[in-house]
Each structure stands twice: as structure tokens, then as C-alpha cells.
């Protein structure tokens, strides 16, 4: 049954016409509207866009639109005083130096105010060095170099090629490997798909093409010098010093044909294995140090970007609901781009800009949600999810108490194969009703469902006939709502074929060549996958923000509870002779996922059969389901991560795009034959079982009859 | 509506000070700058220099470092030019001009009506 | 210091006509120039902002434009209000420079 019919809700041809009214064509002609000059954050630029949309969704019909502005850490490269890698001879002349801008794509050759590519909050710096190849600069590429390979990367500039993890992970993992400097660089392997031309032909990264992106290890707490409360006019600031998650050594991005420059030259040891080769015509020694010939040449970094407190601006849009205006249902995506913003953000925000349009164009004719729908156009994601957390401090108090969902509305593709969704299980039956209910965009499909399509292609690994869901992790800016706030959240883009297409993200991201060329000629000419993620969204946010009773099912949570358990427990077990000999047990932590499993069943029952006609009860029913996501948060925190508050999901420690789950106990056992101190690590992994327990325990109580 | 309101024309000995002011209403005064621009008679525009009232920034044309300060005042939404050692050379109007205060802007967007400096012994 | 020409200094011309004034920058200044406006009692008033947008309440019949160095002022059809005084400005870097003035007379 649909999500419609299960729940008696809102009469079906409100769906369709809010559906119906979204068109391919008013998406494109948004795009281009808002990708025809740079919109960096903290620019008159942005700010700009941020009064035109604020102005078009008034115009639109919504009730109110304001902006809401914060002063906030922003990161930006010095004007007259440019970022760049140098070689230097032993007399320490200059005899190569990385190019100082990308080459701008055809058409945009007169346009001004394109940041050139830097990594944002770098520090100031002018290491040199040897270099030293360190692969992804992932945690397991540091242990290889330095536990198999024993190189020592202290006092060494680190050269890692994107992709994999987040950037600012590589960061942190060379900051702890006593690195002085590191420079990330786009290899081909993994940014330049076999059979495609680099842009403008094709939709690959040329040469000198350069990923920007912020290097941050924030953990959730939005402005670096306002941790948990909003950057507004009367905020107290800590010091740089004291500032949150800010590098510590220069970092700066390249290209791959710098990088062939740097990398040509390497000698030392060569590569453990072929993982550690990427497609340039280049040995991938790991080093320290050039070969031979060029051993006295070193590598010198010039960087001197500044940070700077610098004002931003979301746009927040209100549609207030008729029946329970305290409920908030709220779609949300950034607006500031690196550069032109193609695809990041720019996508998504005429997704969300034809959505509101679509909903305005309702209410106009006098309908109105049952809920209130909040829209808001964030700003400075790129430099840290900073916008959409610093108002989500601004109103905690108001979203703890009266947030239903978060539907995050960022890049509406990645690729053209099919759709990509992560979300709260809550949201798992609420995804498949509606991608049964929406016709698929993609060939060979022809007449059938999306849900038929996005099954045949990216199923579930666990369930046949379904398709894949994946947990929610970071990078975006759900983040504050559901790892920190507890808010059910959920995302969803058409991706790419992750079978064929091993490059990370997409080959032009974060870069010049992200132009609405690139999606009208390459991605989506007909924008038919930009409309089906519109009605995804769309969809979702209608059937959330206008269902008699929220369509959440608790039992999901359930199995995914079990499944997680499951996983961590496989994982303690590798160390069987510890865990006899710290007494550690998990019966604890699989009892409270019972109580749940039996719980939410007849919690589930009930919300069959209960009076719906009775406001109160109703009110209940809803409330139980609004606030379990919220019974799931630890108002302590995870350890050394006081803004990851949810105790089933936060992002990996390793990689803050990924969801990692019961990441307490998962970081407690990580790694842990290398503990100094075996008791008192095994002895967190005990006390981490023992929150993830309670927490899960608490949180079935709250499906409980209530009286 | 955005409105830069100056004060009135000064008349000064050479040798003295004068301090001009440009009284901001309709926007948001932190989220803007003040830019200073000098047009002696029958002649062009000179920048003088800016000031960001929220982080309290000044920059200044080299030319009048040290003739030209700068200040403001956010809690009356004004922004001042102190001008010193005043010589006939100092004789002009002088504008206000709204500029935005981010990494990229637009420059001065709204303009004050000028005040007019006449420095004679 | 960028230096920025502007020419003609002074340009007489009939209503309804098309004109056009011209600033040459001495470095690359990207689309950072504006075009002011002047009234004969000294109110200054931008008219278009990086190079060829139009500020809000300015009349379409205002363009810019720009070739290379050379960066333009058009007015399609002259009325009689526009017989004034305009300036061009750079703002690439600092300190922000003006060119000499275009005054626009009525022939």
C-alpha cells in the first residue's frame, strides 16, 4: 500500500497537482539564472542571490521570506599575494611553479571574481621539503607507510591524491604523521572516466582543472569561533588559537598536470602495491625525496590565504501549515558555490526554487499543508555547513521541540544512472511508496516505476527486490539537524553506475569547469533526472509536511538496529581471547534491540488502529513517531565530538562523508591491538556498549503506551 | 529606501581640522562599508579610502594616508572623515558612497549628496 | 595605480541618437567597472555595475559592455535628461580609480 492509503491521508490529487506543476523546463531556466557568475560566500555576489531569491519565493506565494545573517570564520586567498608550489634547486631558485588560476572554460573568459583554487583555512606557510606520496591519505594508507613500510612523514610535504575520503580527514591524518605541508592533487584514476573528453568535449577534468574545498575538521560545530551557539552580533568569539577543527599546516590543491611535475621526480621507495598507482605516466614512489639526478631539489609551499570573520546570509521561507503550524517540515540547500556552481549547489537550488514555486502555485488556488513547510537557501556550506548550522544554534530550542523532517537539497546529480538515497530508516517506507508512485526518467524504463528502475540498478545488498538505502553521513548540511539535533533527515540525487565508474564524486567538482554547460550538454539535456529528484523531494516533503499521520515506520529502525548490532559485535569478535578476558558482552546492547523490535511491532498495531478522528490521541501517535529519531541523541555527545550526538549514526572518524553506525562502540574497538593500554580500552569499548544499550533501551520506552 | 545623508558645507582655515560625517539609514549599516571620494572643482573623482563599520577595517588610498581618517560609529549608523593640516589643496566635495563589506563586491552602489570643504584664510 | 582613459571628454549629441563612451584600463581589471552618473548639482547615481549589469530603476535604454581593454558606455536613444556628466570606475584593486569624465551636451 502507499504511504496514502495506509495512513489516510491528504486526498491524492493534492500529491498530483503539487507534482504535476513541476516542470523540467522552469528547473533549467533556474540553473541558468543562478550559474552565470560566481556566488562565493561572504561575496556581494551571493548576497545578491540571496535578495533574488528571497524576493522570488515571496513572489511565489510563500508567507514570509527573511534572511537570516551570521558573522562567521571565512577563508580566502590573499588578492595580491597568490597560493603556489614551487620546485626549488639547492641554491633555492624556483625552477617550476604550479599555475596560479585554471584556464576558464569557453565563454566565461571575461568573467571576474573566480576565487582560484586554494584550500580553504589554510594556514599562512612557506615549508619546504622533501615530498612524500602518501596515496589517499587515508588512516589505513598512513599505517601502511608507516607500520609496513616504516617512512617516517615528520618534517616531510605530503603529496595525496584526492578522493575516497573528505579532504579535511587527508588533513588531520597528515597533521598527525607530523607532516609540515600537504598538497592534494586530482589523479586521472580517479577524476577522469576511460572513453570521455576532458571539459569542454566531455564531462572530464582537464589537466588544469583543481578541486577547491574547505580542510576543516569541524565535527559538527558550525562557525570555528562560535562552537554550539549562533555567530550573531553580540557573540562572544574564541581566539584563532582556540578556534575549532582549524589545519595546522599549509595544505593547497593542484591539478594532475602539476602534479605529473611533482610526482615525476620521485624517488625512494616505490609503491607497496598497485592500490597505489593512479594513471599519470609517473612510478608513484612513495619517496621522501626526489630521485637520483634531482635529490637536492626540494618542494616549497607559498601560501597566504587569511581567515576573516565575515558576514553570511540564509534565506529562510516559510509555508505555515493550517492544521499544526507548530510541526516543521523543512527543505533546505546551500546557494554558495565554489565558483559557478553547475552542479554544487546549483542543481539542487533550482530543485528546491521550482519546488517552492510548485507549492506557492497551491496555496495560491488556497490550499495549505497541514504542517508548516520551511524552506531555506544556506549559505557558506562550502566552508563548513556554516549557514544552516548557526541558525540551527540560532533556533534549537524551537527545532528540538517542533522538527518532524529535514529533507537536504544539495547536488540534484552526481551522474545520470539512477537515484541515490540516504536516509533515516524512519523514512525507508515513505522513500519506497513514493519511487513506486513516480515514473522512472531512465531508458529502458519506459512506462515503469522509479522504484523499478533504481531497484534493478543499485539493489539492496540485504533485501531482494528492494533497493539500496544508505546511511546518512556528513558533508552536508543535514548534519546539525539529524547527527546533532536528532531531526529525522533524509537526501536524495541521481548518481552514477558506482560499478563502472570507480572516480570519487564527480570528475569537474569544486572546480571552474562546473558550468550549467556542463549538465545542459553532458548530464541532463531534457533536466528529466533534475524533475524526478524534484518529485523525490518534492514528494517527500508534501507527504511529511501533509500526511494525517507522519510517515514514519518504527519498525525499520528496528531491523537496521539489529543488523548494526550484528555488525559491531562480528567486529569485537576478531579479538576473542580480550573480550573473555575483559568480560565484554554485547547481551546487553541485542536485549535493548529486542525490547525495541518488540516495541515499535506493537507500537505499529496500535498506529493502525487507533481513532484517528481524535486530535489528541493523534497528537500523540505523531509526537511518539517526531520524537524517536530525537530519543536517539546522547546529549553528551560522542567522545571528543560534543556536537555528533546521535548514538546509532555519526560521521566515520575516518571520512566524514560516511556514516558509520553505533560509532561509539565502533571508534572504542578501532585499531585497538595498537592500545597502550589494553584495560582501559577495552574498558571504553564496555562503557560505549553500555550507552549504545541505554540509548536504544530509552528509545523503545518512548513507543511504549504511554500511560 | 537606502539613504546617505551628509552633513553640511564646511568652511576652514588652512592648518586646521574639519570632521565630516554621511549618516546611513535604510539597510543594514555592518553589513555595508563607507567609501570616501574627493571631486575638486570642474575636476574628476578621487578615491579617498573605505571603512567597514562591523569589523572596523580601514583602507586608504596612500596618497591621503595621513591627511584622511576614518572612523564610525554603528550604533548611530554614521560614518566620519576627519580631514587635518588642511591646505587650498583640500578644497572640494566630498562623497560618501555606499560599498559592500565581503571578499568580492560591486563597489560604491549608493552615493551620499557630498559636502562641500572650502579651506581659505 | 591602474589608470583608466576615459574618452571623449566632452561629446555633444542630438535626442534620440546612440552614443557611446569608452574607459581604456592601463592593466587587467576582469568585469570590475561600474559607470556613474552625474547631475549638474553634484548627485552621483551608479548606472551599471561589472561592466554590463544594469542597477534596479536604471532605464534599458543604458548598456555596457566591454573588448579586451576597452570597456563601453552605450545609450541607445538619447533623452534629455541624459545630458549630463559620467564617470567610469575600477574597482579590480585597490586604490580604486576613476577615469577623467565623458561630459555629455546637448547639440
Known amino acids: 500500500k502507499s504511504s496514502n492509503e495506509a495512513t489516510n491521508i491528504t486526498p491524492k490529487h493534492n500529491m498530483k497537482a503539487f507534482l504535476d506543476e513541476l516542470k523540467a523546463e522552469n528547473i533549467k531556466k533556474f540553473l541558468y539564472n543562478f550559474t552565470q557568475i560566481p556566488h562565493l560566500a561572504g561575496t556581494e555576489q551571493n548576497f545578491q542571490l540571496a535578495k533574488q531569491i528571497q524576493s522570488q519565493w515571496k513572489e511565489f506565494g510563500l508567507d514570509s521570506v527573511e534572511l537570516a545573517h551570521y558573522d562567521v570564520l571565512l577563508s580566502y586567498p590573499n588578492k595580491t599575494h597568490p597560493n603556489y608550489i614551487s620546485i626549488i634547486n639547492e641554491d633555492g631558485n624556483e625552477i617550476f611553479n604550479t599555475s596560479l588560476f585554471e584556464p576558464p572554460p569557453p565563454g566565461y573568459e571575461n568573467v571576474s571574481d573566480i576565487v582560484p583554487p586554494f584550500s580553504a583555512f589554510s594556514p599562512q606557510g612557506m615549508p619546504e621539503g622533501d615530498l612524500v606520496y602518501v596515496n589517499y591519505a587515508r588512516t589505513e594508507d598512513f599505517f601502511k607507510l608507516e607500520r609496513d613500510m616504516k617512512i617516517n612523514c615528520s618534517g616531510k610535504i605530503v603529496i595525496a591524491r584526492y578522493g575516497k575520503v573528505f579532504r579535511g580527514n587527508k588533513v588531520k591524518n597528515a597533521q598527525l604523521a607530523g607532516a609540515k605541508g600537504v598538497i592534494l592533487y586530482s589523479d586521472p584514476a580517479d577524476y577522469f572516466a576511460p572513453g570521455v573528453k576532458s571539459y569542454p568535449d566531455g564531462w572530464n577534468l582537464p589537466g588544469g582543472g583543481v578541486q577547491r574545498g574547505n580542510i576543516l575538521n569541524l565535527n559538527g560545530a558550525g562557525d570555528p569561533l562560535t562552537p554550539g551557539y549562533p555567530a550573531n552580533e553580540y557573540a562572544y568569539r574564541r581566539g584563532i588559537a582556540e578556534a575549532v577543527g582549524l589545519p595546522s599546516i599549509p595544505v593547497h590543491p593542484i591539478g594532475y598536470y602539476d602534479a605529473q611535475k611533482l610526482l615525476e621526480k620521485m624517488g625512494g621507495s616505490a609503491p607497496p602495491d598497485s592500490s597505489w598507482r593512479g594513471s599519470l605516466k609517473v612510478p608513484y614512489n612513495v619517496g621522501p625525496g626526489f630521485t637520483g639526478n634531482f635529490s637536492t631539489q626540494k618542494v616549497k609551499m607559498h601560501i597566504h590565504s587569511t581567515n576573516e570573520v565575515t558576514r553570511i546570509y540564509n534565506v529562510i521561507g516559510t509555508l505555515r501549515g493550517a492544521v499544526e503550524p507548530d510541526r516543521y517540515v523543512i527543505l533546505g540547500g546551500h546557494r554558495d558555490s565554489w565558483v559557478f556552481g553547475g552542479i554544487d549547489p546549483q542543481s539542487g537550488a533550482a530543485v528546491v526554487h521550482e519546488i517552492v514555486r510548485s507549492f506557492g502555485t497551491l496555496k495560491k488556488e488556497g490550499w495549505r499543508p497541514r504542517r508548516t513547510i520551511l524552506f531555506a537557501s544556506w549559505d557558506a556550506e562550502e566552508f563548513g555547513l556554516l549557514g544552516s548550522t548557526e541558525w540551527a544554534e540560532e533556533n534549537s530550542r524551537l527545532l528540538q521541540e517542533r522538527g518532524v523532517a529535514y529533507i537536504n537539497a544539495d547536488s540534484s546529480i552526481e551522474g545520470n544512472y539512477t537515484l541515490r538515497v540516504d536516509c533515516t530508516p524512519l523514512m525507508y517506507s515513505l522513500v519506497h511508496n513514493l519511487t513506486k508512485e513516480l515514473k522512472s526518467p531512465d531508458e529502458g524504463f519506459e512506462g515503469k516505476s522509479l522504484y523499478e528502475s533504481w531497484t534493478k540498478k543499485s539493489p539492496s545488498p540485504e533485501f531482494s527486490g528492494m533497493p539500496r538505502i544508505s546511511k546518512l553521513g556528513s558533508g552536508n548540511d543535514f548534519e546539525v539537524f539529524f547527527q546533532r539535533l536528532g531531526i529525522a533527515s533524509g537526501r536524495a540525487r541521481y548518481t552514477k553506475n558506482w560499478e563502472t565508474n570507480k572516480f570519487s564524486g564527480y570528475p569537474l567538482y569544486h572546480s571552474v569547469y562546473e558550468t550549467y554547460e556542463l549538465v545542459e550538454k553532458f548530464y541532463d539535456p531534457m533536466f528529466k533526472y533534475h524533475l524526478t529528484v524534484a518529485q523525490v523531494r518534492g514528494g517527500m516533503v508534501f507527504e511529511l509536511a501533509n500526511s494525517i499521520v507522519l510517515p514514519f515506520d518504527c519498525r525499520d529502525y528496528a531491523v537496521v538496529l539489529r543488523k548494526y548490532a550484528d555488525k559491531i559485535y562480528s567486529i569485537s569478535m576478531k579479538h576473542p581471547q580480550e573480550m573473555k578476558t575483559y568480560s565484554v558482552s554485547f547481551d546487553s546492547l541485542f536485549s535493548a534491540v529486542k525490547n525495541f523490535t518488540e516495541i515499535a511491532s506493537k507500537f505499529s498495531e496500535r498506529l493502525q488502529d487507533f481513532d484517528k478522528s481524535n486530535p489528541i490521541v493523534l497528537r500523540m501517535m505523531n509526537d511518539q513517531l517526531m520524537f524517536l529519531e530525537r530519543a536517539f541523541i546522547d546529549p553528551l555527545g560522542l567522545p571528543d565530538r560534543p556536537f555528533y550526538r546521535h548514538v546509532i549514526y555519526a560521521p566515520s572518524s575516518h571520512n566524514k562523508y560516511a556514516g558509520e553506525s553505533f560509532p561509539g562502540i565502533y571508534d572504542a574497538l578501532f585499531d585497538i591491538e595498537s592500545k597502550v593500554d589494553p584495560s582501559k580500552a577495552w574498558g571504553e569499548v564496555k562503557r560505549q556498549i553500555y550507552v549504545a544499550a541505554f540509548t536504544v533501551q530509552a528509545a523503545a520506552e518512548t513507543l511504549s503506551e504511554v500511560a | 529606501q537606502v539613504q546617505l545623508q551628509q552633513s553640511g558645507a564646511e568652511l576652514a582655515r588652512p592648518g586646521a581640522s574639519v570632521k565630516l560625517s554621511c549618516k546611513a539609514s535604510?539597510?543594514?549599516?555592518?553589513?555595508?562599508?563607507i567609501s570616501w571620494v574627493k571631486q575638486r572643482t570642474g575636476q574628476g573623482l578621487e578615491w579617498i579610502g573605505e571603512i567597514f563599520p562591523r569589523r572596523g577595517n580601514t583602507y586608504y588610498n596612500e596618497k591621503f594616508r595621513g591627511k584622511a581618517t576614518l572612523t564610525a560609529d554603528k550604533s548611530s549608523s554614521a560614518a566620519y572623515m576627519e580631514l587635518r593640516s588642511l591646505t587650498s589643496e583640500d578644497s572640494a566635495v566630498y562623497f560618501c558612497?555606499?560599498?559592500?563589506?565581503?571578499?568580492?563586491?560591486?563597489?560604491?552602489?549608493?552615493w551620499g549628496q557630498g559636502t562641500s570643504v572650502t579651506v581659505s584664510s | 595605480d591602474i589608470q583608466m582613459t576615459q574618452s571623449p571628454s566632452s561629446l555633444s549629441a542630438s535626442l534620440g541618437e546612440r552614443v557611446s563612451l569608452t574607459c581604456r584600463a592601463s592593466?587587467?581589471?576582469?568585469?570590475?567597472l561600474n559607470w556613474l552618473q552625474q547631475q549638474p548639482d553634484g548627485t552621483i547615481k551608479r548606472l551599471i555595475y561589472?561592466?554590463?549589469s544594469l542597477d534596479s530603476g536604471v532605464p534599458t535604454r543604458f548598456s555596457g559592455s566591454r573588448s579586451g581593454s576597452d570597456y563601453s558606455l552605450t545609450i541607445s536613444s538619447l533623452e534629455s535628461e541624459d545630458f549630463v556628466d559620467y564617470y567610469c570606475l575600477q574597482y579590480a584593486s585597490s586604490p580604486y580609480t576613476f577615469g577623467g569624465g565623458t561630459k555629455l551636451e546637448i547639440k
Open positions: 561589472a561592466t554590463s
Open positions: 535604510g539597510y543594514t549599516f555592518t553589513s555595508y562599508g
Open positions: 592593466q587587467d581589471i576582469g568585469s570590475s
Open positions: 558612497a555606499r560599498v559592500f563589506d565581503g571578499y568580492y563586491n560591486y563597489a560604491m552602489d549608493y
